[in-house]
Interface confidence: low
């Protein structure tokens, strides 16, 4: 025979419990029905009658099977900075969450008690950590070679566009401006929003908003057969390449001839021992910067002859947008006799991307003026070793070049000879948009 189904109310067997969705009424000493979600107990059971349930009134609810005498009141209406993601029904409480562009500054068990607007990063700063439902945006200064020209809670620092010929170098809040030749860029030129797809390796632009200090390189003086920047998407038109190459080659030959003539006349050239500093500045050192990294523009010693290179400090200074911000740590103001390079990667997360190497080479054409020759080859290399601590960073490490090195080198040696082993291939050498600034 099938077991009899007990209908509520019923007396449980000694030592046993009531079934699911039943409760034991201690007065009636019977197992009685619970009320379903959306209802409450209007009359409790007796030995002969089961629980009488009633629907919850407006703006009240019960979420569980229950035997409460009265339903719970729904929470108050959502405030203007909130969105009602779950309406108050007879079976569930109202849930308020923050509307887009806001985050929950003070949460409660379900939904949010207090919303606050997401921080917006101003130009020169990008999003280091995106906002979430419960945390605000974290901004960081754009590192050299990157920029952000928007006030946004989603835009990260983007790499400067890579120009054939730079008209105006970029800085932390402005992209590089190219001359009429079409630029190449490792990513689409539009504003980069989070989250962001993984880009090419050389640019280091990863989904976590940690743009590295990959400088955009202007190919003013191609030194030998340089391949295009890794990750660049466009090929240079052949005629343009020929014109630039021939022009550059001509200028170089003139420079060499000048130097040779001056040497044979026994007028020893006043090759200034320009020194390229190679400070191993860790990313940590720049973490506490008040503002974005300064974009230092390279200037050469004034020369009476003009060339395709800007030789006037004042001309460059006029073009460079001055930023009234404290000088970034590790970037010392240099005199005309020396060029100092440094990088400070404002990395908001420890570890960063490991060692990053930026190698730049600047070649000045020798020119003769008042029987004195001025020629200099300046090499500046920067390495941000995210694993080294600030105390390990040599304060004033100088890498002088000998007088014989005043003539340009075709490849300026490999960066490994200057910096030791590196993890990444250097970008092709050229004049960076972020160079040195005279004091």
């Amino acid at each position: 025979l099938p077991a009899q189904v007990a209908f509520t109310p019923y007396a449980p067997e000694p030592g046993s419990t009531c079934r699911l969705r039943e409760y034991y009424d201690q007065t009636a000493q019977m197992c009685c029905s619970k009320c379903s979600p959306g209802q409450h107990a209007k009359v409790f059971c007796t030995k002969t009658s089961d629980t009488v349930c009633d629907s919850c009134e407006d703006s009240t609810y019960t979420q569980l099977w229950n035997w409460v005498p009265e339903c719970l009141s729904c929470g108050s209406r959502c405030s203007s900075d909130q969105v009602e993601t779950q309406a108050c029904t007879r079976e569930q409480n109202r849930i308020c969450t923050c509307r887009p562009g806001w985050y929950c500054a003070l949460s409660k068990q379900e939904g949010c008690r207090l919303c606050a607007p997401l921080r917006k990063c101003r130009p020169g700063f990008g999003v280091a950590r995106p906002g979430t439902e419960t945390s605000d945006v974290v901004c960081k200064p754009c590192a050299p070679g990157t920029f952000s020209n928007t006030t946004s809670s989603t835009d990260i620092c983007r790499p400067h566009q890579i120009c054939n010929v730079v008209a105006i170098p970029g800085n932390a809040s402005m992209d590089a401006v190219c001359t009429s030749t079409s630029p190449t860029r490792s990513m689409a030129p539009g504003a980069v929003h989070l989250p962001q797809p993984v880009s090419t390796r050389s640019q280091h632009t990863q989904p976590t908003p940690e743009p590295s200090t990959a400088p955009s390189t202007s190919f003013l003086l191609p030194m030998g057969p340089s391949p295009p920047a890794e990750g660049s998407t466009g090929d240079f038109a052949l005629p343009v390449g020929l014109i630039v190459g021939v022009t550059a080659l001509g200028l170089l030959i003139i420079g060499v001839v000048n130097c040779v003539i001056m040497t044979q006349v026994k007028k020893k050239p006043l090759c200034l021992q320009r020194e390229a500093k190679v400070p191993h500045l860790p990313a940590d050192k720049a973490r506490g910067t008040q503002g974005p990294e300064q974009q230092h523009l390279l200037i050469t010693a004034p020369s009476s002859s003009s060339s395709s290179l800007e030789s006037s400090a004042s001309a460059l200074d006029r073009r460079a947008p001055t930023r009234n911000q404290p000088q970034a740590p590790g970037v010392e103001a240099s005199g005309a006799g020396e060029a100092r390079a440094s990088t400070g990667s404002s990395d908001s997360s420890p570890g960063g991307h490991g060692t990053q190497v930026n190698v730049t080479c600047i070649v000045n054409v020798c020119s003769s003026s008042d029987h004195s020759s001025q020629c200099s080859s300046q090499a500046s290399s920067t390495m941000g070793d995210t694993d080294s601590s600030p105390s390990e960073s040599p304060k004033d490490e100088q890498v002088p070049f000998s007088k014989e090195e005043c003539a340009f080198r075709s490849q300026l040696e490999t960066p490994e000879t200057l910096l030791g082993s590196t993890e990444e291939k250097p970008l092709p050498l050229g004049v960076p948009d972020a160079g040195m600034k005279p004091s």
Partner: antibody, heavy 122, light 112 residues
Framework: QQQLEESGGDLVKPGASLTVTCTAS?????????MCWVRQAPGKGLEWIGC????????TYYANWAKGRFTISKTSSTTVTLEMTSLTAADTATYFC??????????????WGPGTLVTVSS | DIVMTQTPASVSVPVGGTVTIKCQAS??????LSWYQQKPGQPPKRLIY???TLASGVPSRFSGSGSGTEFTLTISDLECADAATYYC??????????????FGGGTEVVVK
């Protein structure tokens, strides 16, 4: 062992505000519990102030006389507060924190704290 | 709010005697009623809930009865330790916009 303890009782002047806190130990607030406040003036009877259903940070329920001047809040998974404003001498009392239940009507007011004394006097 | 009226306010009973305390609700609270015992300097202790169910650890000398609006607490075989103030409380829904959690005014029991 499950316990409640009130703190924050003090001597304050009329018109002042005061917040007293109830801290639970041995358990944390769950869907099953309400936390309530009851007060008792010296030599007088017990007076129910209100309750909060802390697991969803509300709703709160108050005696009609307590609405407006008294606010019950959950500040953590083991603490609730009673904020009192515009205090008068009539509010001088020992304030008790009491645990109640949502899903078992047979377990009402089964756990009490020792109370904290609030004195309102100029 | 519901109003709970408790009588008498005070009663004096000899040891071994029986005391009966009445509690009246201003409206029906079914059997949502608890009884508490409070001694000086201590918080109340629950004796009975759901009108007639003894809380754990409470002697069977204590009993409760009633439903709707009329309730009674009876203490038999009175002991000196029973000297205290006794309160009834409507707990017909702590979320009680309708009923509230009103206490009666209390009954002081003096054991002679």
């Amino acid at each position: 062992q499950q316990q409640l303890e009130e703190s924050g009782g003090d001597l304050v002047k009329p018109g002042a505000s005061l917040t007293v806190t109830c801290t639970a130990s041995g358990f944390s607030f769950t869907n099953n519990y309400y936390m309530c406040w009851v007060r008792q003036a010296p030599g007088k009877g017990l007076e129910w102030i209100g309750c909060i259903y802390p697991s969803i940070v509300g709703p709160t329920y108050y005696a009609n006389w307590a609405k407006g001047r008294f606010t019950i809040s959950k500040t953590s998974s083991t603490t609730v507060t009673l904020e009192m404003t515009s205090l008068t001498a009539a509010d001088t009392a020992t304030y008790f924190c009491v645990r109640d239940r949502y899903d078992d009507y047979g377990d009402y007011f089964n756990l009490w704290g020792p109370g904290t004394l609030v004195t309102v006097s100029s | 709010d519901i109003v709970m009226t408790q009588t008498p306010a005070s009663v004096s009973v000899p040891v071994g005697g029986t005391v009966t305390i009445k509690c009246q609700a201003s409206q029906s609270i079914y059997n949502y009623l608890s009884w508490y015992q409070q001694k000086p300097g201590q918080p109340p202790k629950r004796l009975i809930y759901y009108a007639s169910t003894l809380a754990s650890g409470v002697p069977s000398r204590f009993s409760g009865s009633g439903s709707g609006t009329e309730f009674t607490l009876t203490i038999s075989d009175l002991e000196c330790a029973d000297a205290a103030t006794y309160y009834c409380q409507s707990n017909s829904g702590v979320n009680g916009n309708r009923y509230g959690n009103a206490f009666g005014g209390g009954t002081e029991v003096v054991v002679k």
